[in-house]
């Protein structure tokens, strides 16, 4: 089966990652995009730092750490309104993700 | 990076019972974690799972008998109405998430507790 | 509910063979399966997951292959420190998970 440009291979992803400094040191804010080509019941989201499939369930009632979006050694922490997470490493600094 | 399981004892049938994962070296709020439990002699038997968010899922034997809840280093199995087929090891697990090359996500259960013992006996 | 058939339930096998150890999903779990190794009176220990993928650690004489609902774990060359027992785990943390029945591996 060919693809047409711009299409994703079953089980595949890609991502857009806009990254901007924040005025506090500290703080790395983040902006990405993802998409992948999921099972059935899953939609394209952020796993362990990387692009990945997770259930549909997770992006409908925004409980985006239960993507487990951090990276191991990290905790993950949702923003206020659920607008997105943070990833707080073990020196403190904080990675903060938006979603829109 | 460790677990541990406590709280297991000689109960009598129809007695609650809660036993306790305490989590070492790692934060709960990134990691899905797992009871699973062994009968003497048997093999392992899948009980429920909790997400980073607090929310629950049950093996289908398991609904309304049994409530995984947590706090931020310990994760709790409720147990009622135990009956002597309840006698086993409980073990809990720390479950991650592996991203496979094409973006697909599969579950690890890449760390465990050593088991308590819990007795149903009259 | 998801059902993970394993076979066989017991194998014996001598240090250098090759162990091939089945488990059948009832339905499509798109390579949701992991391998866990278990000694007596021990935790298990993860072997694979995702149906293929190597834990870290692991000795690379272990592996995993299948899709769909037919997976298998193989162990090649198999040496004394394999007795043990093994399980298959399949499906997906947010729907149905399962064990399978486990293989007792015996090193003659």
């Known amino acids: 089966q060919f693809l047409k440009e711009g299409q994703l291979a079953a089980g595949t992803c890609e991502i857009v990652t806009l990254d901007r400094d924040s005025s506090q040191p500290r703080i790395e804010e983040r902006s990405q995009t993802a998409r992948c080509a999921c099972r059935k019941g899953q939609i394209a989201g952020t796993t362990r730092a990387r692009p990945a499939c997770v259930d549909a369930r997770i992006i409908k009632t925004k409980q985006w750490c239960d993507m487990l979006p951090c990276l191991e050694g990290e905790g993950c922490d949702l923003l206020i309104n659920r607008s997105g997470w943070t990833c707080t490493q073990p020196g403190g600094r904080i990675k903060t993700t938006t979603v829109s | 990076q460790s677990l541990e399981e406590s709280g297991g004892r000689l109960v009598t049938p129809g007695t609650p019972l809660t036993l306790t994962c305490t989590a070492s070296g790692f934060s709960l709020s990134n990691y899905y974690m797992g009871w699973v439990r062994q009968a003497p002699g048997e093999g392992l038997e899948w009980i429920g799972i909790?997400?980073?968010?607090?929310s629950t899922y049950y093996a289908s034997w398991a609904k309304g008998r049994f409530t995984i809840s947590k706090t931020s280093t310990t994760v709790d199995l409720k147990m009622t109405s135990l009956t002597t087929e309840d006698t086993a090891t409980y073990f809990c697990?720390?479950?991650?998430?592996?991203?496979?090359?094409?973006?697909?996500?599969?579950?690890?259960?890449?760390?465990w507790g050593q088991g308590t013992l819990v007795t149903v006996s009259s | 509910e998801l059902d993970m058939t394993q076979t066989p339930p017991s194998l014996s096998a001598s240090v250098g063979e090759t162990v091939r150890i089945r488990c059948l999903a009832s339905?499509?779990?798109?390579?949701?399966i992991s391998w866990y190794q278990q000694k007596p009176g021990k935790p298990p220990t993860l072997l694979i997951y995702g149906a293929s993928n190597l834990e870290s650690g692991v000795p690379p004489r272990f592996s995993g292959s299948g899709s769909g609902t037919d997976y298998t774990l193989t162990i090649g060359g198999v040496q004394a420190e394999d007795a043990a027992t093994y399980y298959c785990l399949g499906g997906y943390s947010y729907s149905s998970i399962t064990f399978g029945a486990g293989t007792n591996v015996e090193i003659k």
């Open positions: 339905e499509d779990i798109y390579s949701g």
């Open positions: 697990a720390r479950i991650d998430i592996g991203v496979g090359d094409y973006g697909w996500a599969y579950d690890r259960l890449d760390l």
């Open positions: 909790i997400y980073a968010s607090g």
